[in-house]
Amino acid sequence: LSVQQGPNLLQVRQGSQATLVCQVDQATAWERLRVKWTKDGAILCQPYITNGSLSLGVCGPQGRLSWQAPSHLTLQLDPVSLNHSGAYVCWAAVEIPELEEAEGNITRLFVDPDDPTQNRNRIASFPG
């Protein structure tokens, strides 16, 4: 089992949309695949895929999950808020026929505030 995640770095504006993609490949067929997205180490969602369908379509705040055969798991954040910023990791495990797991590399998401003055205020608020 191998997992490739992208992009490595994603910078978007608050209120727009962010798309994170995870490519899951296995040399042999699988009956059930458990997938998981985490943000800064905390689990956002942990659905499974069987018969070509996800058991859950929601993944964290404003997150939508989709599976496109043969291998693409997509997490779409829409609309993006400032607290979506963080480090996202995709993990996958074949549960049936036999356990095998792998995870992707980190995607770092940076969300820029919609109001540029908000950005200036934030920067100015850091101690001297």
């Epitope: 089992l1 191998s2 490949d25 296995q26 040399a27 042999t28 067929a29 699988w30 009956e31 695949l33 895929i49 069987t50 018969n51 070509g52 055969a69 043969p70 291998s71 026929p97 095998e100 792998a102």
Partner: antibody
């Protein structure tokens, strides 16, 4: 590009252990998503998958041979090896090593093969 | 184990004519999860190791002449050579990778009539 080369004795006595090594060049056997297999071709041309070792060192064997087979690796030499115990004349075959990836699940690179005869 | 049954055992076809080789699996090789058939076709010439032609039942490997094509789904698959060339004389094998153990068909010997 990746190349595979089998080596080992061409003649093994019945009841002994057949030992072969596959040396891989141009690619690391520890690369994520890759599997390193042994396949044999019997004199009648029949192809038989023996088993594989994957990038993490995990193995999978053909149940028909499982009790007699061990596949191991030496990452420092970029080699993987086959041991087949208690051989009989039925194990006489051309033994090949080959690689396969998760993403493209086919044997895309093969060694040239080495003939092993089991005879006293 | 999944049994792969190839037919015919041997085939003689005139140059420029169509050659058709069949492969039947003892269980379906199609996965609804990935929308793929886990079936490959190989060509083996005398003294050489097998060479991949077709993967996922119908995807031709880059560099393989377009006279080679694969079709079928589930349990029944076909390799077709649309116009036989002299260099196509070889043994042809189907192989599944739906699960372990991976198994091959017994091969079809293709000759020129």
């Amino acid at each position: 590009q990746v190349q595979l080369q089998e080596s080992g004795p061409g003649l093994v006595k019945p009841s002994q252990t057949l030992s072969l090594t596959c040396t891989v060049s141009g690619f690391s056997i520890s690369t994520s998503g890759y599997y390193w297999s042994w396949i044999r071709q019997h004199p009648g041309k029949r192809l038989e998958w023996i088993g594989y070792i994957n990038y993490g060192g995990g193995t999978s064997y053909n149940p028909s041979l499982k009790s007699r087979v061990t596949i191991s690796r030496d990452t420092s030499k970029n080699q993987f090896s086959l041991k087949l115990s208690s051989v009989t004349a039925a194990d006489t075959a051309v033994y090949c090593c080959a690689t396969m990836a998760d993403r493209f699940a086919f044997f895309d690179v093969w060694g040239q093969g080495t003939m092993v005869t089991v005879s006293s | 184990d999944i049994v792969m049954t190839q037919s015919p055992d041997s085939l003689a076809v005139s140059l420029g004519e169509r050659a058709t080789i069949n492969c039947k699996s003892s269980q379906s090789l199609f996965s609804s999860n990935t929308n793929r058939n886990y079936l490959n076709w190989y060509q083996q010439k005398p003294g050489q190791s097998p060479k991949l032609l077709i993967y996922h039942a119908s995807t031709r490997l880059s560099g393989v002449p377009d006279r080679f094509s694969g079709s079928g789904s589930g349990t029944d698959f076909t390799l077709t050579i649309s116009s036989l060339q002299a260099e196509d004389v070889a043994d042809y094998y189907c192989q599944h990778h739906y699960e372990t153990p991976l198994t091959f068909g017994d091969g079809t010997k293709l000759e020129i009539k």
